[in-house]
Interface confidence: low
Amino acid sequence: MEQRGQNAPAASGARKRHGPGPREARGARPGPRVPKTLVLVVAAVLLLVSAESALITQQDLAPQQRAAPQQKRSSPSEGLCPPGHHISEDGRDCISCKYGQDYSTHWNDLLFCLRCTRCDSGEVELSPCTTTRNTVCQCEEGTFREEDSPEMCRKCRTGCPRGMVKVGDCTPWSDIECVHKESGTKHSGEVPAVEETVTSSPGTPASPCSLSGIIIGVTVAAVVLIVAVFVCKSLLWKKVLPYLKGICSGGGGDPERVDRSSQRPGAEDNVLNEIVSILQPTQVPEQEMEVQEPAEPTGVNMLSPGESEHLLEPAEAERSQRRRLLVPANEGDPTETLRQCFDDFADLVPFDSWEPLMRKLGLMDNEIKVAKAEAAGHRDTLYTMLIKWVNKTGRDASVHTLLDALETLGERLAKQKIEDHLLSSGKFMYLEGNADSAMS
């Protein structure tokens, strides 16, 4: 798949559209002006303190514990409803989510609240689902969940290999750590950093601390951010955006599928995420967050997924001549952007089609066997096979190859699900182009 650029085919008559949202970033400049950025950061930090304390005192209490019961209905603000609510069908009301059953974390125009995650067996519930926050699950004692296999808790090793000594205990997010007695190097050969032996977690429930402690912590974060602003200048938003967008599941995609890695301790406490939600109380679509994006990129016509349908009014004859191409929304590497979404595909592609799909994509039976053997667990199998496919085919591993393979297999609904998911996650968007110039 080519990356979008000056020479990308332009759709005749199409023009750049932003996703529907409450406001547009007007008069965007090539780079952020530092004073304005500083003001935003400071404002964000101050808001963060008050917002966090408000969240703790109000939103995390069960309904019966709140001072005043939340109204069942209220009116949408600029077409969006606040966290803890979803919009009614007619768009006139905001209806509250059901405590303990479903939730919404941001300003939204969801027709339904998202269903609460239930912790798997082998997990403990760290914090319950509220109307504004999903359940947080953590591996039970003696097990851990690592980055490479976020879907399951794995048993911690009981001891270190011969000639090694234990320097770190089993925690819900890491196995025991072992180092060689003589050299002091970890099993992997790295020299252990001091921090690596610390077993406390940012994700464990914080003990009640004074406001001054919060302010000190936040101030440090602010200083770091201010330095970053000066260093990065115009690159700031480009650098921050990938973090803001989160991994594929994090963008309002499949409500059935909650990516567990986003629920691992600390993941939801990302300062960047907090700042964005404060700076954008009405959830400005991601395309509008890139404030220094040139007002009109030359030679390329981008369509946000939410508005692309308005350009699809030509006759069927013309429509058949065109192919709507999925491209990364943030101009990232197409193959890498797709790879970040693989973890979700196991829920979207029927199990019986996993192997036929991989054969269709060019994996040999032996490679499939190896992938199955390497997979951490059943759910991880498709992910592992897809990674093998990417490693094998490199730049040729495109979203369209994958979708076409599903179509060929007759898995049209799986194809639809993945296409929808890639769009609603905010990772991909449509580039309107001619079928004969379709990028793969």
Epitope: L110, P285, G306, E307, L312, P350, F351, G410, L413, Q416
Partner: antibody, heavy 126, light 107 residues
């Protein structure tokens, strides 16, 4: 909220066009289905069209003969039935796919069909 | 195509009974399963989506469970208005398919 029309008695090989008028909800935000039920039999899915009309899928038994379409400006769903056969005799229901939408991006595979019309009867007989 | 097999095809029960209907998919469908209730001469009514989630407005006496290939619809305490035909439907892949139906009759 969904009212089907256009049913009737028709001879084999002839054509018929069914309509489904929607009201009470934002029609253009939902995928729509046709489902049929032959006399004394179970339910059979016929076709689906996405909210924007860009994707359409059909049951093998009607592929190439039936065409699903929609006019969002008129809040109406259609089923054009050509080359009708005796086995197409059934009550035809239109049904709304429950959608999950955020920022104008809708996905239609989470919640199934929640709103159904009362049906219109199609009889194919010589 | 994914075949959906419902059992039993019919059952007789009394008011107050606990009734269980099963549905089996010919291949794994995750939790992409819905249950519908249909009364004679009427359109189907959606009861459950995503295998276990209750459609809004549906009484809690209805519950669904299962994932993969085996699914269950349970009516905890049968009431006169519950005598009807129940269908399961998969929406994991096209073509969408329904089970053959289970007719719940008064004993």
């Amino acid at each position: 909220q969904l009212v089907e029309s256009g049913g009737g008695v028709v001879q084999p090989g002839r054509s018929l066009r069914l309509s489904c008028a929607a009201s009470g909800f934002t029609f253009s935000s939902y995928g729509m289905h046709w489902v049929r039920q032959a006399p004394g039999k179970g339910l059979e899915w016929v076709a689906v069209i996405w909210y924007d009309g860009r994707n359409k899928y059909y049951a093998d038994s009607v592929k190439g003969r039936f065409t699903i379409s929609r006019d969002n400006s008129k809040n109406t769903l259609y089923l054009q039935m050509n080359s009708l056969r005796a086995e197409d005799t059934a009550v035809y229901y239109c049904a709304r796919e429950v959608g999950y939408c955020t920022n104008g991006v809708c996905s239609y595979y989470y919640y199934g069909m929640d709103v159904w019309g009362q049906g219109t009867t199609v009889t194919v007989s010589s | 195509d994914i075949q959906m097999t419902q059992s039993p095809s019919s059952l007789s029960a009394s008011v107050g009974d606990r009734v269980t209907i099963t549905c089996r998919a010919s291949q794994g469908i995750s939790n992409y399963l819905a249950w519908f209730q249909q009364k004679p001469g009427k359109a189907p009514k959606s009861l459950i989506y995503a295998a276990s989630s209750l459609q809004s407005g549906v009484p809690s006496k209805f519950s669904g469970s299962g994932s993969g290939t085996d699914f269950t619809l349970t009516i905890s305490s049968l009431q006169p208005e519950d005598f009807a035909t129940y269908y399961c439907q998969q929406y994991n892949s096209y073509p969408l398919t329904f089970g053959g139906g289970t007719k719940v009759e008064i004993k």
